[in-house]
Interface confidence: medium
């Protein structure tokens, strides 16, 4: 069974998938469609790297631009370095500016909804 066929079989169960499962899927050439990606738990999507999302979505990564204002894409963008987002070649904006340090302060983030940044 190839990645696409496997994805079809598990698609209906993915809504509650944890980050670890999504990372594993990104290595299996599944080409997750955007409709499914948009239904994933935001907290599961946030830790994914730009490279992992690109692998997870396959051709559908090109559709991220259309969803950049919607959750979970919007929140995921806020967590990525702008340099990394730029490598997607989609013009996504809103990432962490170059030279900033990201502090993973869970309480701060829980209160504000955004990561805490220290300037250069």
């Amino acid at each position: 069974m190839n990645g696409s066929e496997y994805f079809v079989k598990i698609q209906s169960f993915l809504g509650g998938a944890p980050t670890e499962d999504l990372k594993a899927l990104s290595q299996q050439n599944v080409s997750m469609d955007l409709a499914t990606f948009m239904k994933l738990r935001t907290d599961a999507v946030l830790p994914l790297t730009v490279a992992e999302v690109q692998k997870l979505l396959g051709p559908h990564v090109e559709g991220l631009k259309a969803e950049e204002r919607h959750r979970p894409v919007r929140d995921w963008i806020l967590r990525q370095r702008q340099d990394d987002l730029d490598t997607l070649g989609l013009g996504l904006q809103g990432g962490i500016p170059n030279g900033y340090l990201v502090l993973d302060l869970s309480m701060q983030e829980a209160l504000s909804g955004t990561p805490c940044l220290l300037g250069p």
Epitope: A35, D86, T87
Partner: antibody, heavy 120, light 107 residues
């Protein structure tokens, strides 16, 4: 208005290489991946590969992987498709087409096509 | 690779009548399908995306339906300018693939 202007027709001998250009205007070149599709006489359309204009990363159809190279010149908003080791069955019209422009998937805009004739 | 099989290969329909073109994918592609119209000597023109949504400027006599593996393009009332070859395309996974085309003519 989105415009894709391709280079002119080419006649090549078997074993030679051809490089076709596609100059884009009317949109942000680095925000949309450029794809190349070819059509041999009386045949179906055939996807060759694409390129991420931001960093030059590419995906290729396995059928062409060892013979095709897709590149970009960001400063000139131009994409290139080079096909090597030409054979008679490579005689076709070659098209460039960005995907997902205006947030809709599919190839909504196409270049005018470049006829490449391979003949001894 | 996902193989897209179109039927029929050609279709002759009277002006004002309905034309129906089928496209079958070799595996589930969801609704990640587009349809194109190509006239002789011209680049393809996009008609439908996501299986059933018309691109702006496409007449509403063109409609698409289906999901999974079976898709249909319908021209509800054939006009002279609709004479062309029609292609389906999947963008669900790499490599992107096209159907073999259906030639629509006037009876």
């Amino acid at each position: 208005e989105v415009q894709l202007v391709q280079s002119g027709a080419e006649v090549k001998k078997p074993g030679a290489s051809v490089k076709v250009s596609c100059k884009a205007s009317g949109y942000t070149f680095t925000s949309y991946w450029m794809h190349w599709v070819r059509q041999a006489p009386g045949q179906r359309l055939e996807w060759m590969g694409n390129v991420n204009p931001s960093n030059g990363g590419s995906n290729y159809n396995e059928k062409f992987k060892n013979r095709v190279t897709i590149t970009v010149d960001k400063s000139a908003s131009t994409a290139y498709m080079e096909l090597s080791s030409l054979r008679s069955e490579d005689t076709a019209v070659y098209y460039c087409a960005p995907h997902y422009i205006g947030s809709r998937p599919g190839f909504a805009y196409w270049g005018q096509g470049t006829l490449v004739t391979v003949s001894s | 690779d996902i193989v897209m099989t179109q039927s029929p290969d050609s279709l002759a329909v009277s002006l004002g009548e309905r034309a129906t073109i089928n496209c079958k994918a070799s595996q589930n592609v969801g609704t990640n399908i587009a349809w194109y119209q190509q006239k002789p000597g011209q680049s393809p023109k996009a008609l439908i995306y996501s299986a059933s949504y018309r691109y702006s400027g496409v007449p509403d006599r063109f409609s698409g339906s289906g999901s999974g593996t079976d898709f249909t393009l319908t021209i509800s009332s054939l006009q002279a300018e609709d004479v062309a070859v029609y292609y389906c395309q999947q963008y669900n996974s790499y490599p992107l693939t096209f159907g073999g085309g259906t030639k629509v003519e006037i009876k």
